[in-house]
Interface confidence: low
Amino acid sequence: VPGEAEQPAPELVEVEVGSTALLKCGLSQSQGNLSHVDWFSVHKEKRTLIFRVRQGQGQSEPGEYEQRLSLQDRGATLALTQVTPQDERIFLCQGKRPRSQEYRIQLRVYKAPEEPNIQVNPLGIPVNSKEPEEVATCVGRNGYPIPQVIWYKNGRPLKEEKNRVHIQSSQTVESSGLYTLQSILKAQLVKEDKDAQFYCELNYRLPSGNHMKESREVTVPVFYPTEKVWLEVEPVGMLKEGDRVEIRCLADGNPPPHFSISKQNPSTREAEEETTNDNGVLVLEPARKEHSGRYECQGLDLDTMISLLSEPQELLVNYVSDVRVSPAAPERQEGSSLTLTCEAESSQDLEFQWLREETGQVLERGPVLQLHDLKREAGGGYRCVASVPSIPGLNRTQLVNVAIFGPPWMAFKERKVWVKENMVLNLSCEASGHPRPTISWNVNGTASEQDQDPQRVLSTLNVLVTPELLETGVECTASNDLGKNTSILFLELVNLTTLTPDSNTTTGLSTSTASPHTRANSTSTERKLPEPESRG
């Protein structure tokens, strides 16, 4: 009203949605009697009577506040329960006596929004887009008043930037009067943003002060063209025949291009496409020397149809060929000499070793083994091992059998066998020579012959012990083109009172076996042979 003194600013009361606002009438006793007060709400400059106080007794007026108002503090304070956003307005109390005075209260209402929900653009963003593309959407539900949103990339706040960053925010009012904020971040991204972390932050106020809530961090799929492709080979290092080798294409683009792996044909020098598995990996299993060669990868961008070629990768599958020994089946007279030569091809430097097959003893380090003044003991197996020292496990071997001409040579000349009458005896007799001998027995029984190796034969005889057999004994005779030789087996009855050390006390003498003792075939040569190596 013109001429009146300017009204003082209303008192500010701040509360959270759902709580109770205490509206204290600030009229002094001189300004009015608090036992006679009218309370009004002011909305859009329209006053509505909501509560009367008479003689200190309160009475709600019909309307929106009817159920939520009560008098407190001996009539000085009006309590408004279950505050809603719609209650954000001015409330005034008016004293009637001695003259009409009023006191105004501004009610401010607050509600923290829910945790912000961030959704990344699932379709992704190409780096070469002409204008900012949608990166992510942030939604903050049920806040009051409208919270403020800030977008972050790698922990740094993003500002609007012409043609680069655009933040588009909108809000809706729920039936409760609370706000839901939706903010869309649009940006032009670069390749380096493929690992960038984006999140949104909601800033809001409560009676207790300023607060904020952060969304989770998200990365957005960024599509950028491939600039280079390259090949990767596993395992790393020297490869050998038999290995499982994987050749894969890699590219620095997203999405990766369509890969094909080619190998240069050594004859035509043309690149020929190889068949890869479902993952685009060329698996060589087992790897062979033929897999060696120059490989390259082609990456084809199916959108632009631009093709990129990798730098060629030279693949070497190391190998050792079949080992050849000459002579392949040597035969020599006793006293003569023999030179064994070993040959093999490899992609790397080879190391040769000659081993005695029966003992594993290393006889020579090198491709040539010379044997002089051959004795019959020198007959038997010799193994050449061709290996690549720099690649563990890469080796090939060949066994050669040396035959020394000579008449049969018996494993034993004579032997005593303890027996019991009427037992079935199992006898064995072994002989060697070249040509390989045959064995005959001087008694009837069931005999069987087994070739032990090219120069050695073993004959076993099952025979019943009779008094006649005890008297005559048993002889086995080995013969070949160069002569014959005999072994004698003396049979003696077991005297149960005087068991000799030769008697078999563990088996109850159900059988007796006459056979040669195990022996190491030593080889006579001109050099002192090295001790067997520990080949761990």
């Epitope: 280079k228 390259w230 990767e232 790393v236 290092g237 730098e311 060629p312 990768q313 030279e314």
Partner: antibody, heavy 120, light 107 residues
Framework: QVQLVESGGGVVQPGRSLRLSCAAS????????MHWVRQAPGKGLEWVAV????????YYADSVKGRFTISRDNSKNTLYLQMNSLRAEDTAVYYC???????????????WGQGTTVTV | DIQMTQSPSSLSASVGDRVTITCRAS??????LAWYQQNPGKVPKLLIY???TLQSGVPSRFSGSGSGTDFTLTISSLQPEDVATYYC?????????FGPGTKVDIS
């Protein structure tokens, strides 16, 4: 035996140019990607540049991009590093080194030269 | 670009001790990692390539492990000649950055 020998180092004023050479012997130079690596006094190793076996691919460290050029002459078994617009921070021992399996995206550098000193 | 970090920056150990140096890449580099040894006043020497493959001629007390972002160089029994600075280097894609180095000496 396999050997790399650098040359061409010296004292130069800032802003000037220098060309380093690396002579290779004992292996098939034209089959291997080659690198330049440098080491400032009392500091660690810094990779400078690489060139593919045939010279078609070249990559540089950000600190030298646009100022240094790597090249090779396979007929002379020689690797080069042309250094322009030299700065005080380019002062270092420069080594040339060979890629272990000969390709650019490789697994290591197995043969190194003794290095040549550049003082700016 | 991918950054390479090494820890510790220096260490002191006794002869015969087991020594472990770690190298970390800011992004995955599969097994494209090499380890070098540089003795005082000498040229760098390749010890390990492909993260775990021992270069020929390197004593077996050196070993490497790891894949992706975390890698380890181990000296199983430190010897006087192992006093040096050790560097890791990534080879996944250019630039082929070195780690800052770890100085090893004998206490």
């Amino acid at each position: 035996q396999v050997q790399l020998v650098e040359s061409g180092g010296g004292v130069v004023q800032p802003g000037r140019s220098l060309r380093l050479s690396c002579a290779a012997s004992g292996f098939t130079f034209s089959s291997y990607a080659m690198h330049w690596v440098r080491q400032a006094p009392g500091k660690g190793l810094e990779w400078v540049a690489v060139i593919s076996y045939d010279g078609s691919n070249k990559y540089y460290a950000d600190s030298v991009k646009g100022r240094f050029t790597i090249s090779r002459d396979n007929s002379k078994n020689t690797l080069y590093l042309q250094m322009n617009s030299l700065r005080a921070e380019d002062t270092a021992v420069y080594y040339c080194a060979r890629s272990i399996f000969g390709v650019v995206i490789d697994y290591g550098m197995d043969v190194w030269g003794q290095g040549t000193t550049v003082t700016v | 670009d991918i950054q390479m970090t090494q820890s510790p920056s220096s260490l002191s150990a006794s002869v015969g001790d087991r020594v472990t140096i770690t190298c970390r890449a800011s992004q995955g580099i599969r097994n494209y990692l090499a380890w070098y040894q540089q003795n005082p006043g000498k040229v760098p020497k390749l010890l390990i390539y492909g993260a775990s493959t021992l270069q020929s001629g390197v004593p077996s007390r050196f070993s490497g492990s790891g894949s992706g972002t975390d890698f380890t160089l181990t000296i199983s029994s430190l010897q006087p000649e192992d006093v040096a600075t050790y560097y890791c280097q990534k080879f996944s894609s250019p630039p082929f950055t070195f780690g800052p180095g770890t100085k090893v000496d004998i206490s």
